[in-house]
C-alpha cells in the first residue's frame, strides 16, 4: 500500500490540458526529496518524463511542468496539448530513483467527439452481450487496438490490446480477432448494464493515421409482458434467458420498490406466501424454465422478473425477463374452500371446479411437494391409475355438466396434511389449490362398518352393514366398490329409511350391502358414504377379503348384520356378485407437454377412456343391498 496518492484514472480529449495532483505524507524528507513523473513501459521500466530536479523529456518539451507544493504535501504535473499518444500508464513518485514511493496513474486521451454519420447502432437487452465490430486498414494491423467510451468530450478506454481493461468492465470486456482476419477486430462486452449505454469509439493505430469506428450502444430495460389473470386462477411465467446462463441458478422475483424479492429459485428458496401454490420447472438444457403459480390472490398483482445468477438472486448485468401481472377480481372461477379439515381415520370430500364448457376434459388431483423447485405428482385422474399408497382410499367422482368434480380421500392420517391441486387437461387457468389439514380424531367416526374384519366365502351370501348417525338421516346413503378408475355406486338397502321421519333411533340407522353368491372377483375395497345430490359427504372404507369354503365346515354367518339381512323379507337378495371392469388408464404425457411439473402416476396406457363413472352402476354385472 503506497503512501503516495493520486488519481487512478485520468481521462481527457485531444488538445486539452491535465493537472495531476499527487499527495505524499507530510514529512521533512518527503517535502524536499525528488518528485518525478514517468511513463511505464511494457518491459517494466518507467521512463522519466519530468522531475523536480529540472529534467524534462523531449516529448514533454514546451508543454509540461512539475510543481511541488511542500506546504500542502502535494506536487502537480501539468501536461498541455494532449494527443492520443499520451494515453498510457504512468507513475507519480518520490525518491532518487523511479523505484521509490510511487502511485500508478492511467491516462486516457481521446479524440474530440463528433457524432459521425457512420455510427453503427447496437441494441441489446440488459444482461446480454454485445459484439462491437471495429474495421481498420492494413497499415494498422500491428498497431494498438482499443475501445473507449465517450463521456462528455472525453473518451475513456474500456479495453485495449495491451490488456488494459477499465475496472467497470473487468471480466466483462474482451478484445479479440477472428481467424485470419487482418482488417477487423472485435470487442465483446457481456453482462450489459444500463450505464453501459452510450457512444463508443474503437481505434486501431495512433495519431492521424489511426482507423476509428463509432458505435452507439443502447441497453434496453426488459419491456414487461402484460398478463391479465382472474382471481383464483393460475399463471405461468415462461422464462427463456438463453444458453449462456443454462448452468446458472434461476429465480423468479417480485419487484418491491428498488429491490426484487425472490419468490422461488432453483437453490430451494421459496417465499412462504407462495407455499403450496408454486412450481418451478426446467424446460430444456438451454436455460428455459417456467414458474407456475396457482390460486392467484389480489395481492399477487405486480411486477415480476425472472433471471439467472449463480447466487439464485437478482444481480445487475445478468439477463432478465419481466412481466406485469394484473389480477382481475371479477373472476369466472368460483370461490372454493382453500382449507379443508379432516380427522385421522375420517374422510374429506374436495370439490374441484373446472370450466363447465370443458366437461369432457380429463380431471386430475395432485399432491404438491415442497422439495427443491416444488412438484405435483398426480394421485388420481379420470385416466390415471391411483398412485401407490392411495389404493382403496382415493377416488375421483366426475359430475359432467356441473362444472365440478369431487375427490374423496378417506382413512386419513396426519401424513395426508398438505397442499393438493385440482387440474384438468383443458383450461389451465382452472387450477385450484387446497390445503388439507388432518388433526387427530377425538371421537368415533360418524360412519362405522360391521363386521370390521370382513371375509366373505365364495358361493355364500355375505352382508356388510354401515351404521350412520341421525344427522345423516335425510341424506342419500350409498355403497360403492372401489377400483382404480373410481368408486362405482352399487344398489343398497337403507334400513333406517323405513322409520318415521319424526323419530330417529341412533342404533338402528343402517345401510347394508349383500353379495350373493360371493365370487372371487368381489374381493376388494368397498366404501360406505353419504351424499346429497351431487354433493358428497363422509365416507368410510372396508376391505372385503374373499376365500374358498373349507371342506366340511358348516356355513356360519359371521355377523349380526348378516343375521338381520335374513330377517328382512322385503329385501331382495341379488343373485350375482359385484363385478369390476378394472380399466387401467395412464395420464397421457402429451397433456402436459408444457407442464411437466405435473407428474404422471400411472404406468399403463390405454387408448379408450375408462367407462365407469361414479353415480352409475354401469359396467357392473351384479349389485348389492
Amino acid at each position: 500500500q503506497s503512501p503516495i496518492f493520486g488519481p487512478q484514472d485520468v481521462s481527457s480529449i485531444e488538445g486539452n490540458s491535465v493537472s495531476i495532483t499527487c499527495y505524499y505524507p507530510d514529512t521533512s524528507v518527503n517535502r524536499h526529496t525528488r518528485k518525478y513523473w514517468c511513463r511505464q513501459g511494457a518491459n517494466g521500466y518507467c521512463a522519466t518524463l519530468i522531475s523536480s530536479n529540472g529534467y524534462l523529456s523531449k516529448e514533454y518539451s514546451g508543454r509540461a511542468s512539475l510543481i511541488n507544493f511542500p506546504e500542502n504535501s502535494t506536487f502537480v504535473i501539468n501536461i498541455a496539448h494532449l494527443t492520443q499518444e499520451d494515453t498510457g500508464s504512468y507513475k507519480c513518485g518520490l525518491g532518487t530513483t523511479n523505484r521509490g514511493l510511487f502511485f500508478d496513474v492511467s491516462l486516457e486521451v481521446s479524440q474530440v467527439p463528433e457524432f459521425p454519420n457512420d455510427t453503427h447502432v447496437y441494441t441489446k437487452d440488459i444482461g446480454r452481450t454485445v459484439t462491437i465490430e471495429c474495421r481498420f486498414k492494413e497499415g494498422n494491423a500491428h498497431s494498438k487496438k482499443s475501445l473507449c467510451k465517450k463521456r462528455g468530450e472525453a473518451c475513456e478506454v474500456v479495453i485495449d490490446s495491451t490488456e488494459y481493461v477499465d475496472p467497470s468492465y473487468k471480466d466483462r470486456a474482451i478484445l479479440f480477432m477472428k481467424g485470419t482476419s487482418r482488417d477487423i477486430f472485435y470487442v465483446n462486452i457481456s453482462h450489459l448494464i444500463p450505464s453501459d449505454a452510450g457512444l463508443y469509439v474503437c481505434q486501431a493505430g495512433e495519431g492521424p493515421s489511426a482507423d476509428k469506428n463509432n458505435a452507439d450502444l443502447q441497453v434496453l430495460e426488459p419491456e414487461p409482458e402484460l398478463l391479465y389473470k382472474d382471481l383464483r386462477s393460475s399463471v405461468t411465467f415462461e422464462c427463456d434467458l438463453g444458453r449462456e446462463v443454462a448452468n446458472d441458478a434461476k429465480y423468479l422475483c417480485r419487484k418491491n420498490k428498488e429491490t426484487c424479492d425472490v419468490i422461488i429459485n432453483t437453490l430451494g428458496k421459496r417465499d412462504p406466501a407462495f407455499e403450496g401454490r408454486i412450481l418451478l420447472t426446467p424446460r430444456d438444457d438451454n436455460g428455459r424454465f417456467s414458474v407456475l403459480i396457482t390460486g392467484l390472490r389480489k395481492e399477487d398483482a405486480g411486477h415480476y422478473q425472472c433471471g439467472a445468477h449463480s447466487s439464485g438472486l437478482p444481480q445487475e448485468g445478468w439477463p432478465v425477463q419481466a412481466w406485469q401481472l394484473f389480477v382481475n377480481e371479477e373472476s369466472t372461477i368460483p370461490n372454493s374452500r382453500s382449507v379443508v379439515k379432516g380427522v385421522t381415520g375420517g374422510s374429506v370430500a374436495i370439490v374441484c371446479p373446472y370450466n363447465p364448457k370443458e366437461s369432457s376434459s380429463l380431471k386430475y388431483w395432485c399432491h404438491w411437494e415442497a422439495d427443491e423447485n416444488g412438484r405435483c405428482p398426480v394421485l388420481v385422474g379420470t385416466q390415471a391409475l391411483v398412485q401407490e399408497g392411495y389404493e382403496g382410499r382415493l377416488a375421483l367422482f366426475d359430475q359432467p355438466g356441473s362444472g365440478a368434480y369431487t375427490v374423496i380421500l378417506n382413512q386419513l392420517t396426519t401424513q395426508d396434511s398438505g397442499f393438493y391441486w385440482c387440474l384438468t387437461d383443458g383450461d389451465s387457468r382452472w387450477r385450484t389449490t387446497i390445503e388439507l389439514q388432518v388433526a387427530e380424531a377425538t371421537k368415533k367416526p360418524d360412519l362405522e362398518v360391521t363386521p370390521q374384519n370382513a371375509t366373505a366365502v365364495i358361493g355364500e351370501t355375505f352382508t356388510i352393514s354401515c351404521h350412520y348417525p341421525c344427522k345423516f338421516y335425510s341424506q342419500e346413503k350409498y355403497w360403492c366398490k372401489w377400483s382404480n378408475d373410481g368408486c362405482h355406486i352399487l344398489p343398497s338397502h337403507d334400513e333406517g329409511a323405513r322409520q318415521s321421519s319424526v323419530s330417529c333411533d341412533q342404533s338402528s340407522q343402517i345401510v347394508s350391502m349383500t353379495l350373493n353368491p360371493v365370487k372371487k372377483e368381489d374381493e376388494g375395497w368397498y366404501w360406505c358414504g353419504v351424499k346429497e345430490g351431487q354433493v358428497y359427504g363422509e365416507t368410510t372404507a372396508i376391505y372385503v377379503a374373499v376365500e374358498e369354503r373349507t371342506r366340511g365346515s358348516p356355513h356360519i354367518n359371521p355377523t349380526d348384520a348378516n343375521a338381520r339381512a335374513k330377517d328382512a323379507p322385503e329385501e331382495e337378495a341379488m343373485e350375482s356378485s359385484v363385478r369390476e371392469d378394472e380399466n387401467k388408464a395412464n395420464l397421457d404425457p402429451r397433456l402436459f407437454a408444457d407442464e411437466r411439473e405435473i407428474q404422471n402416476a400411472g404406468d399403463q396406457a390405454q387408448e379408450n377412456r375408462a367407462s365407469g363413472n361414479a353415480g352409475s352402476a354401469g359396467g357392473q354385472s351384479g349389485s348389492s343391498k
Epitope: V10, S11, T74, E156
Partner: nanobody
Framework: EVQLVESGGGLVQSGGSLRLSCAAS????????VGWFRQAPGKEREFVTA??????????YYADSVKGRFTISRDNARNTVDLQMNSLKPEDSAVYYC?????????????????WGQGTLVTVSS
C-alpha cells in the same frame, strides 16, 4: 448551496453488487469533486472513492481496499455521480456518504468538502 442526496443503499449478500447514486440539486456538477465516504458502527469515517472533473477532463480516485471492485462514474444527463460496488464483502457494510467540494486542489480523501449528504446504509450479509 449544493444539496446532495444519496440513494441505492440496502441489504445485499456477500459477493453481490449494489449501485449508489449521489444526486446534486441547487447547481449542476461542474468543475467539482464528488467523493464517497463510509462509516461503519464504532469506526471512523473513511474515504472510498472520488471523481473530479474540469471541463472534459476527469480524474478518478480509489482507496486501496476498493480498487478493482468499485467504480465511480458521472452521469451528465441525470446530474448524478454513481458508485458501482461489485464483489461486496461484509467489511464493506457501513453508512455511505456522498460529499462535494469546489476546490480543485484539496485532497479528495480529506474532510474539507463543502457539502455532505445524509448517508445511505449498505449492509452486506455473509
Amino acid at each position: 448551496e449544493v444539496q446532495l442526496v444519496e440513494s441505492g443503499g440496502g441489504l445485499v449478500q456477500s459477493g453481490g453488487s449494489l449501485r449508489l447514486s449521489c444526486a446534486a440539486s441547487g447547481r449542476t456538477f461542474d468543475q467539482f469533486t464528488v467523493g464517497w465516504f463510509r462509516q461503519a458502527p464504532g469506526k471512523e469515517r473513511e474515504f472510498v472513492t472520488a471523481i473530479r472533473w474540469s471541463g472534459s477532463t476527469t480524474y478518478r480516485y480509489y482507496a486501496d481496499s476498493v480498487k478493482g471492485r468499485f467504480t465511480i462514474s458521472r452521469d451528465n444527463a441525470r446530474n448524478t455521480v454513481d458508485l458501482q460496488m461489485n464483489s461486496l464483502k461484509p467489511e464493506d457494510s457501513a453508512v455511505y456518504y456522498c460529499a462535494g467540494q469546489m476546490s480543485q486542489w484539496s485532497d479528495p480523501r480529506g474532510d474539507d468538502y463543502d457539502s455532505w449528504g445524509q448517508g445511505t446504509l449498505v449492509t452486506v450479509s455473509s
